[in-house]
């Protein structure tokens, strides 16, 4: 009856501070409206990074000022987080909620540890 959410254990952000991972959920019912939230856990504090609600078969739409983008395909959501810096290294948890039709279901992944390494500044050229 519980909803299982799977996500990779570790992801390394690229040199431009962008990290992508797949959040996959096993839906117990036929949901038509799904909400996906990315949460960051650091020092036992949890903060919301971004959230999007989408209709099955439609694209995810995050708010315009969100650092997240994403696409959906069936029970998979491909999430991309941009603008990351070394200080943003941490555990990023994918939370999936089946919002419609009833009943409501919630699933929480174990988290993806995202490592961000700030690029070395380019040496001055003469």
């Amino acid at each position: 009856k519980a909803m299982h959410v799977a996500q990779p254990a570790v992801v390394l952000a690229n040199s431009r501070g962008t990290a992508s991972f797949v959040c996959e959920y096993a839906s117990p019912g036929k949901a038509t409206e799904v909400r996906v939230t990315v949460l960051r856990q650091a020092d036992s504090q949890v903060t919301e990074v971004c959230a999007a609600t989408y209709m099955m078969g439609n694209e995810l739409t995050f708010l315009d000022d969100s650092i997240c983008t994403g696409t959906s395909s069936g029970n998979q959501v491909n999430l991309t987080i941009q603008g990351l810096r070394a200080m943003d290294t941490g555990l990023y948890i994918c939370k999936v909620e089946l919002m419609y039709p009833p009943p409501y279901y919630m699933g929480i992944g174990n988290g993806t540890q995202i490592y961000v390494i700030d690029p070395e500044p380019c040496p001055d050229s003469d």
């Epitope: 009856k1 519980a2 909803m3 299982h4 117990p28 409206e33 909400r35 939230t37 949460l39 949890v46 919301e48 959230a51 609600t53 939370k95 909620e97 919002m99 419609y100 009833p102 009943p103 409501y104 279901y105 919630m106 699933g107 929480i108």
Partner: antibody, heavy 118, light 108 residues
Amino acid sequence: QVQLVESGGGVVQPGRSLRLSCVASGFTFNNYGMNWVRQAPGKGLEWVAVIWYGGRNKFYADSVKGRFTISRDNSKNTLYLEMNSLRAEDTAVYYCARADWGGWFDPWGQGTLVTVSS
Amino acid sequence: EIVLTQSPGTLSLSPGERATLSCRASQSVSSTYLAWYQQKPGQAPRLLIHGAFSRATGIPDRFSGSGSGPDFTLTISRLEPEDFAVYYCQQYGTSPFTFGPGTKVDIK
């Protein structure tokens, strides 16, 4: 600090209506689901309803479906419970509770007593 | 609807003793979505444990949660005078969210 304060309880006759309010402070209200839970005198806890985020998605216990309406005003950080066709068995302390990021209920308000009696 | 059953209904113990409270679900509930609450007379419930094992902020370590599948346990290792109260388990993974009927821990 995170705080919830309920109001609007009182004595009401069977068949009449009442609206409860819960004012939230100390957190970003529209990032959280909000619940009503009730407790009849000397009894256990009974979940009543939940409303999520923007307020479009709502779920109810069978015992109140069709009679109670949960709503929220995110601009006022306020949760509501409109109770119609009240019955004696609706007599209870009504608590509002936030669904934290993982779904558990924390914190809770202090509760407001609703007594349905003729 | 997931029905939660708690046992025993009442537990009579002395301060310093160990309390073991049980919560059983009518169908398998993931430990991720199981919470315990404490309620004292005239007060609102207070979150003790979430995710079956994790103590809420400010909860002393004499409280611990365990279990999986349909069976969960709340243990109070050494009862303090302030621990005598009613304890409820709850599942919050799917609607309707449900509570157990409660276990009252009173002074022997």
